[in-house]
């Protein structure tokens, strides 16, 4: 068929909950390409009808929900003007009741369901929720040993659980839970995460580098919407938290009631030697009280700020 096989990806998944896989392989998928999903070498593509339990949504294959019989190899075919590439995804579905201790241990879970916290440090766990734009995710709840996590050492920030002053007792089995809404229907997503601890620094004591901002001011009109990215480079297995703060408080907490200023979801691009992280801050409406206040981007021990200022009056208008 003239298609070049790129790689095989193995995913081990829990039945009875949504799952999605995005067919991306930069730089191939960054150009003008068409993406088509197939199951088990079938010639018939996966349905694109959004009411179907299994359907293709743009470049994604979406299972609403995953069922035990969905195990198998799925192919994603990426066709360009002069090229054809194929990615194989081997899905293994298992029945797991996270809080049923009578059931044996978990299968060999993929790496994002195994995470490490660093003893004595402020660290975080990430709830990996990869879904297309058509899926709306509600707030995330976190559990340890089947009990909802509460306490001043723990803060939920977007898809992360921040853990301050990690102790040996923080190791064990965690789960993050969110409600996913798609076409008016609601589904529960529950990811189990096995969390181990280490004393090792892990990133060799490297200091993250904030590329932007650079401790500068930004001219912005009163009442406008403003989005500012914080771009950070760091080593691949760093344990640094990246966030926006104002008056030494997380912006999401500081503006908890009005939600006028919010931190965005962190994204990252992986390079050979490092990762480039981006986390933005959104001002839905710039108010007078925002001017002159340093909004700080934090990345581990590194910080950089922006200060909003009113544009200089344009006297030519008079």
């Amino acid at each position: 068929d003239g298609c070049k096989d790129i790689f095989m990806k193995n995913e081990i998944l829990s039945a009875s909950q949504p799952f999605a896989f995005n067919c991306t392989f930069p730089p191939i998928t960054s150009g003008e390409v068409s993406v088509t999903w197939y199951k088990n070498s079938s010639k018939i593509p996966v349905s694109k009808i959004i009411q179907s339990r299994i359907h293709q949504d743009e470049t994604w294959i979406l299972f609403l929900p995953m069922e035990w019989g969905d195990s198998g190899v799925y192919q994603c075919v990426i066709k360009g003007r002069d090229s054809c590439h194929r990615i194989h995804v081997n899905l293994t579905v298992f029945e797991k009741h996270w809080c049923d201790t009578s059931i044996g241990g978990l299968p060999n879970l993929s790496d994002e369901y195994k995470q490490i916290l660093h003893l004595g440090k402020d660290d975080s766990l990430t709830c990996h929720l990869h879904f297309p734009k058509s899926c709306v995710l509600g707030p995330i709840k976190w559990y340890k040993d089947c009990n909802e996590i509460k306490g001043e050492r723990f803060t939920v920030l977007e898809t992360r659980l921040l853990v301050s002053n990690v102790s040996a007792e923080d190791r064990g089995n965690y789960a993050c839970q969110a409600i996913l809404t798609h076409s008016g229907k609601q589904y529960e997503v529950l990811n189990g995460i096995t969390v181990s601890i280490t004393e090792r620094a892990g990133y060799g004591g490297s200091v993250p580098k904030i590329i932007y901002p650079k401790n500068h001011s930004i001219e912005v009109q009163l009442g406008t919407t403003l989005i500012v990215d914080c771009n950070v480079t760091d080593t691949k297995d760093n344990t640094n938290l990246r966030c926006w703060r104002v008056n030494n408080t997380l912006v999401d907490d500081y503006y908890d009631e009005s939600k006028r200023i919010r931190e965005g979801v962190e994204t990252h691009v992986s390079f050979r030697e490092h990762n480039l992280y981006t986390v933005n801050i959104t001002f839905l409406e710039v108010k007078m009280e925002d001017y002159g206040l340093p909004f700080m981007c934090h990345a581990g021990v590194s910080t950089a700020y922006i200060i909003l200022q009113l544009p200089a009056p344009d006297f030519r208008a008079y």
């Epitope: 490490i116 190791r171 004393e199 990133y203």
Partner: antibody
Amino acid sequence: EVQLQQSGPSLVKPSQTLSLTCSVTGASITSGYWNWIRNFPGNKLEYMGYISYSGYTYYNPSLKSRISITRDTSKNQYYLQLISVTTEDTATYYCATGGYDYVEDALYYWGQGTSVTVSS
Amino acid sequence: EILLTQSPAIMSATLGEKVTMSCRASSNVRYMYWYQLKSGASPKLWIYLTSNLASGVPARFSGSGSGTSYSLTISSVEAEDAATYFCQQFTTSPYTFGGGTKLEIK
């Protein structure tokens, strides 16, 4: 059950390179920390270094200019290279990993050890 | 570098005797790990996070300590306990082992 199987020569000539392989079954080397330790004659243990889940390497500063730890995730193997060996590098070399009771630093799983003699 | 000094270097005990071996650190250590090494075998994790016994380790063993002073105790020595015991720290790099305590049974 995690198992570590070591392979490599037991005799290396001075100034040459010592190369050892640790083949892992029952776990993926893309999670956790994968260590090398050696035991000198007379029972003196030295921690040599590790390669982490992301490929980050840590080396004992006493070996830094001579040691290299690499991996092949497709084979689920990791490797130790020690260049310019001398008779002082004669030891039993072990690969080991932790993760016991969710503690990465508790080195519970060990290879069988490779006794390496440096001699001409 | 954190130096771990184990004492005594060699100790001899009679069956049923209580023995304690010490591991002193040159700087504060958060947790101590202990390994048992017998001739011709690979080291075995014996005690982790200062006081937790690894799987298969008899309950007569215990670990304790904090800061710079740690110890491993056997409440009633048995013949199979004859081995060399090493302490190790991961608190500060370079990660180091103690010189070992060799336990002999009279």
